[in-house]
Interface confidence: low
């Protein structure tokens, strides 16, 4: 089946700057600003456009060693990024893939809202484990806040 989870979170960082840092340069930023969550991001195949495969490795002690993400769409105009988790991590006997959509929307106060959609494609009639969704949400929040802190501390970066 397909299970859809949608969440929203806010940031004080303007949409364009956040998209540039969090989405377009996350591969470099995440291991730097959140080494406790991501140990490395390796480009396996492609140039960042659709079809690009990235291997994200987690630190020692994590339940999963790595995941492989496939870039689906990068919309620079609307600050939208779609990617799928296709291997490693929770992908396996019960879960086929996770399709994710992140859209960063500017807010009147100069900050932004991140609208996140996660579609879990389970095999057969398996259901999604609640702790899986929770862990994924927490990881996203950890990375976002780490990037946000970095941007606040480095006002000249990603402008």
């Amino acid at each position: 089946g397909v299970f859809n989870y949608e969440t929203e979170t806010t940031s004080v960082i303007p949409a364009a700057r956040l998209f540039k840092a969090f989405i377009l340069d996350g591969d470099n930023l995440f291991p730097k600003v959140a080494p406790q969550a991501i140990s490395s991001v390796e480009n396996i195949e492609g140039n960042g456009g659709p079809g690009t495969i990235k291997k994200i490795s987690f630190p020692e002690g994590f339940p999963f060693k790595y995941v492989k993400d496939r870039v689906d769409e990068v919309d620079h105009t609307n600050f939208k990024y779609n990617y799928s988790v296709i291997e490693g991590g929770p992908i396996g006997d019960t879960l086929e893939k996770i399709s994710n959509e992140i859209k960063i929307v500017a807010t009147p106060d100069g900050g932004s809202i991140l609208k996140i959609s996660n579609k879990y494609h389970t095999k057969g009639d398996h259901e999604v484990k609640a702790e899986q969704v929770k862990a994924s949400k927490e990881m996203g929040e950890t990375l976002l806040r780490a990037v946000e802190s970095y941007l606040l501390a480095h006002s000249d970066a990603y402008n």
Partner: antibody, heavy 125, light 110 residues
Framework: EVQLVESGGGLVQPGGSLRLSCAAS????????MSWVRQVRGRGLDWVAK????????YYVDSVKGRFTISRDNAKNSLFLQMIGLRAEDTAVYYC??????????????????WGHGTTVTVSS | DIVMTQSPLSLPVTPGEPASISCRSG???????????LDWYLQKPGQSPQLLIY???YRASGVPDRFSGSGSGTDFTLNISRVEAEDVGIYYC???????FGQGTKLEIK
Amino acid sequence: EVQLVESGGGLVQPGGSLRLSCAASGFTLSSYWMSWVRQVRGRGLDWVAKIKEDGSEKYYVDSVKGRFTISRDNAKNSLFLQMIGLRAEDTAVYYCVRADFTAAAGTFYYGLDVWGHGTTVTVSS
Amino acid sequence: DIVMTQSPLSLPVTPGEPASISCRSGQSLLHRNGYNYLDWYLQKPGQSPQLLIYLGSYRASGVPDRFSGSGSGTDFTLNISRVEAEDVGIYYCMQALRYTFGQGTKLEIK
């Protein structure tokens, strides 16, 4: 291993009917659009019909509208093509094909990435 | 219907030499999302077709890097940098907006 296996082809008289089946294995059928593509021996490829993941949308080439019906049973990982009013020009090898769209972005597309080996339909008196 | 026209229809090539196949569409395949909805498929003798290139220029998984796709709008090209004996077969372009195939190009070894 990701695989599609067609069955149900055979010899039928003009005006007759056949039901083709396609068994999917190695992946979850409900996550993908599916299509039927046919090929007349020694000729090119012609798309016949396609169906959305949940079966809510179906599209057909003009020449088979009203005669062919595409359907699916995701619980059984199966795709079907019901063909009635068969004509000599429907004689072909029929392929079951997976179309990889990303669920989170319905317009995004990865090609017809898995093909079955085909089943032969012959319409002749 | 969107008509797809391929050329040449027959392509004899010496192993190790490059080869290119042209595909022209009756209308633009450039989607509003910025991608060209044009695929290339290869049907080897006695086999089912296999996907080579999707969205005009993206190589499918497992396809050797000697294959590349280029073009935009209505004019597209499939290039093979160095043809190998295993590349023989019929190459089809296909527009993925309404799923129409070109008539095919038969690549054979000289």
